[in-house]
Interface confidence: low
């Protein structure tokens, strides 16, 4: 039970005090007791419960006619059962006794009031009165946890606006309200109570720029909401009528958790005694609600796809046809960014990452816009953000970034358990340098900080700086699987490719050609590839780099070798000994449920079938996956990207609720 104030009683004159239902009020009966008195008794109105404890050891007794020794070891506490109909209608009488004096009486007139600030602390999607049930001032994780949740109101319900909803002080309509969390102030007081008392709603100054609170006028349109707390207003005096009254507030977060903001916001209601205008306002009671701002959550390839994004560029009609067919098979919506809007920037994966935010009452997809800011710069903000589709960005918006800040370098694993620790929403994966040095690249610290601060998908730094482009999607992918952990990790594997080519040569196919059917591309015989010492050395280095990540992924995701599938792939080292794919990089695939869009490798055709395609099918089809090989050679591959780099996917949010995990 919440602690109330301390009330001092004195025999000289009656004491008047306020007691808030659900709080424990201490009675100081000693400090003003008559000098010669040695004991006391208490009588109270039926609406007041008095507890007397005399310790140690504490002997508890509710009031009766007993007398108690008057010493500091006696604790007297009051609680009230019902709110008062009129001021001071509950009475407590203390009688002091001494050996030589007649009893001396002290009177206490109590006013019982109900004041409670309620939010959805049980995370059911509904606000229930919580008085004396749970402590709302703490926020705890886990299925038995408690605490309310706020969404950053980062969508744009007003299509005529260019800003996010949280960037204005207005409530647009009921759609806008649904992105906010309801908080209710319930009061029950005597009619004249607020002539001498005031309620103040306030937020810590350190948190005022992270939240905005609107007060709703009950029964009126949402447009009657007015802002009461926010970046300019840390406190607000409430006009509350006496009697029984409920007041609704709608709360929106303005910032995601980040390195300087752990995501917790406390809203407090304070009851002030303003009866003596000569004295400062005295705080009689406080009630608080702690909210946690919902984190931005990424979705792995194992989540069902809902929408596919790609770019229309010069001469990629066939590519788009293939992606369209695949999207139709997977029953996905398809959004194409036209040429005039992408300004020849086809790398949809690099520009953005689509995740979501969730509260018990609402789930919202949110696009995380990378700071790479090339031709697709405006696409996330102009075409993706909208009603019920949020937006967030981090990092410098003008320069100061590297290729590792593009979101082909940002992936997330499916849910995993690692040495007993559960990651029910998976773990974020991004590429980094192997060790810091003058010429190494890394993801911008602002991006790293943001990803870590979300708390629910603890990031793992992989090593991708060995690649020319430097993105993790160039050597790994995840696909759904019906068994084991529910997925497989796919890793690009030069070792597996050399093994395959060697087998083909042993069977007499050494003359078979890589790149057959591609105009203006020098074709290569299997036997020449196998005898090319430089290429072998290049791929030996690449293999070591991928093995490095393999070990890291096994350790950080709790994987066994049987959870990993090696996809045959060769690389070549270019400028500064950085690697790029030797033929279309098959691991850089589009995963739409069981439908996979894989870069067509143009491998050696043996018995009428590409041996690389055949190998990949033999590895993935037993998992119930369907492989479609997409020709991206001239439109994507020679520009150092593939199918995954050129597409993006919005996926279904996890059914698991993030607040039920323990980070």
């Amino acid at each position: 039970m919440a602690q109330g104030t301390l009330i001092r009683v004195t025999p000289e004159q009656p004491t008047h005090a306020v007691c808030v239902l659900g709080t424990l009020t201490q009675l100081d009966i000693c400090s003003s007791a008559p000098e010669d008195c040695t004991s006391f008794s208490i009588n109270a109105s039926p609406g007041v419960v008095v507890d007397i404890a005399h310790g140690p050891p504490a002997k508890k007794k509710s009031t009766g006619s007993s007398t108690w020794p008057l010493d500091p070891g006696v604790e007297v506490t009051l609680t009230m059962k019902v709110a008062s109909g009129s001021t001071g209608d509950q009475k407590v009488q203390i009688s002091y006794y001494g050996p030589k004096t007649p009893p001396v009486k002290a009177l206490l007139y109590l006013t019982g009031v109900e004041i409670s600030l309620c939010a959805d602390i049980t995370r059911t999607g509904k606000v229930k009165p919580t008085r004396a049930v749970k402590d709302q001032r703490t926020w705890t994780w886990g299925p038995c946890g408690q605490g309310a949740i706020l969404l950053v109101n980062c969508d744009r319900d007003n299509l005529e606006s260019s800003a996010m909803d949280c960037e204005d002080d207005e409530v647009l309509d009921s759609e806008d309200l649904q992105d906010m969390s309801l908080m209710t102030l319930s009061t029950k007081t005597p009619k004249d109570f607020f002539t001498n008392h005031t309620l103040v709603l306030h937020v810590a100054r350190s948190e005022m720029d992270k939240v905005r609170v609107f007060q709703a006028t009950r029964g009126k349109l949402s447009s009657k909401c007015s802002v009461v707390l926010g970046p300019k207003w840390p406190s607000h005096y409430l006009m509350v009528p006496g009697g029984k009254h409920n007041m609704d507030f709608y709360v929106e977060a303005l910032a995601f958790p980040d390195t300087d903001f752990p995501g917790l916001i406390t809203l407090t209601i304070s009851l002030l005694d303003t009866s003596n205008l000569e004295l400062p306002e005295a705080v009689v009671f406080q009630d608080s609600v702690v909210f946690r701002v919902a984190p931005w959550i990424m979705t792995p390839n194992t989540q069902p796809p809902q929408e596919v994004y790609a770019c229309s560029i010069f001469e990629n009609e066939d590519f788009l046809k293939s992606v369209t067919t695949l999207a139709m098979k997977a029953k996905c919506k398809l959004t194409i960014c036209p040429e005039e809007e992408n300004m020849d920037d086809q790398w949809m994966q690099d520009e953005m990452e689509i995740g979501y935010i969730q509260a018990p009452h609402k789930t919202l997809p949110v696009v995380f816009d990378s700071p790479r800011n090339r031709g697709l710069k405006e696409f996330p903000i102009k075409r993706v953000m909208g009603p019920d589709f949020g937006y967030v960005t981090r990092g410098p918006q003008t320069g100061g970034i590297s290729g590792l800040d593009s979101f082909g370098n940002l992936e997330v694993s499916p849910p995993v358990t690692v040495r007993g620790k559960e990651y029910p929403l998976g773990r974020i994966l991004f590429g980094d340098s192997c060790y810091p040095s003058n010429d190494s690249r890394q993801m911008h610290q602002a991006l790293q900080d943001f990803l870590s601060a979300q708390q629910v998908q603890a990031p793992v730094k992989l090593y991708s700086d060995w690649l020319s482009v430097g993105h993790v999607d160039e050597f790994l992918s995840f696909v759904p699987a019906p068994d084991r952990k529910g997925f497989r990790l796919l890793l690009a594997s030069p070792r597996s490719c050399y093994k395959l080519f060697q087998e083909q040569q042993n069977e007499g196919h050494g003359e078979a050609l890589l790149f057959e059917g591609i105009k203006k591309k020098k074709q290569q015989k299997i036997k020449n590839i196998l005898s090319n010492k430089t290429l072998r050395e290049h791929n030996s280095f690449v293999e070591r780099c991928i093995d490095w990540n393999r070990e890291l992924l096994k350790r950080e995701l709790g994987l066994a070798e049987s959870d990993i599938i090696d996809i045959p792939q060769l690389f070549k080292l270019k400028e500064f000994s950085k690697a790029e794919a030797f033929f279309p990089n098959m691991v850089n695939m589009l995963v739409l449920g069981k439908h996979l869009g894989i870069p067509k490798p143009f491998g050696p055709v043996i018995n009428g079938r590409c041996c690389l395609e055949e190998k990949v099918c033999s590895l993935l089809e037993p998992l119930g996956l369907q492989c479609t090989f997409i020709n991206d050679f001239f439109t994507y591959h020679i520009r150092h990207g593939e199918v995954h780099c050129g597409t993006n996917v919005r996926r279904k949010p996890f059914s698991f609720k993030w607040w039920n995990m323990v980070p």
Epitope: C434, P436, S437, Q442, Q448, W548, L552
Partner: antibody, heavy 119, light 109 residues
């Protein structure tokens, strides 16, 4: 967890060299960086350099450049640190440690080798 | 090179008390590549915290690292008898110029 076993204590004369070995077990030697850190009596640790066996590239702290050689033998999972032109202020405990991915962050440490330089 | 300055040099506390150790860097430590080690006499240092705030495997949650840029803190929320030792901070962001702080000795009062 990786276990590291270092060679025994050495007493050396000024101007001579010392070569300390560090044998690794319980992990993939290739996938770790091995770093060398020394600690003079009553002082804080001092980073000397390190090597990633996988890339076979040693890195040396400026202070020791030209005087220290760090090598690794993948076959025996052993790393070596050789320090030349010894002086009395090189008297210290020399530790090898492995670091996993956070490249130069010592995680699992050897027991240390005391090298005393005295005439 | 980045110079790490630890303060105080010695901290005299009783078991159960909170210890707050500071480590200041002469310039910003990129990626928050800063670690904390505990060292007891005659033993090798033991990794407690890396990347400024991540607890190493097996380290009790009474050890907490915080900070970024140039100011870092190690907090031990309730000192246990086995926590009395020397603590070093270490930045590993600027290979090969990697440095350790001078140490803070936490002793029994």
């Amino acid at each position: 967890e990786v276990q590291l076993l270092e060679s025994g204590a050495e007493v050396k004369k000024p101007g001579s060299s010392v070569k300390v070995s560090c044998k690794s077990s319980g992990g993939t030697f290739n996938n770790y960086a091995v770093v060398w850190v020394r600690q003079a009596p009553g002082q804080g640790p001092e980073w000397m350099g390190g090597i990633i066996p996988m890339f076979d590239t040693p890195h040396y702290a400026q202070k020791f450049q030209g005087r220290v050689t760090i090598t690794a033998d993948e076959d025996t999972s052993t790393a070596y640190m050789e320090l030349n032109s010894l002086r009395s202020d090189d008297t210290a405990v020399y530790y090898c440690a492995t670091s996993y991915f956070r490249q130069w962050l010592p995680r699992d440490w050897g027991q240390g080798t005391l090298v005393t330089v005295s005439s | 090179e980045i110079v790490l300055t630890q303060s105080p040099a010695t901290l005299s506390l009783s078991p159960g008390q909170r210890a707050t150790l500071s480590c200041g860097a002469s310039q910003s430590v990129s990626s928050n590549y800063l670690a904390w080690y505990q060292q007891k006499p005659g033993l090798a240092p033991r990794l407690l915290i890396y990347d400024a705030s991540i607890r190493a495997t097996g380290i009790p949650d009474r050890f907490r690292g915080s900070g970024s840029g140039t100011d870092f803190t190690l907090t031990i929320s309730g000192l246990e008898p086995e926590d009395f030792a020397v603590y070093y901070c270490h930045q590993y962001a600027t290979a090969p110029q990697i440095t350790f702080g001078g140490g803070t000795k936490v002793e029994i009062k």
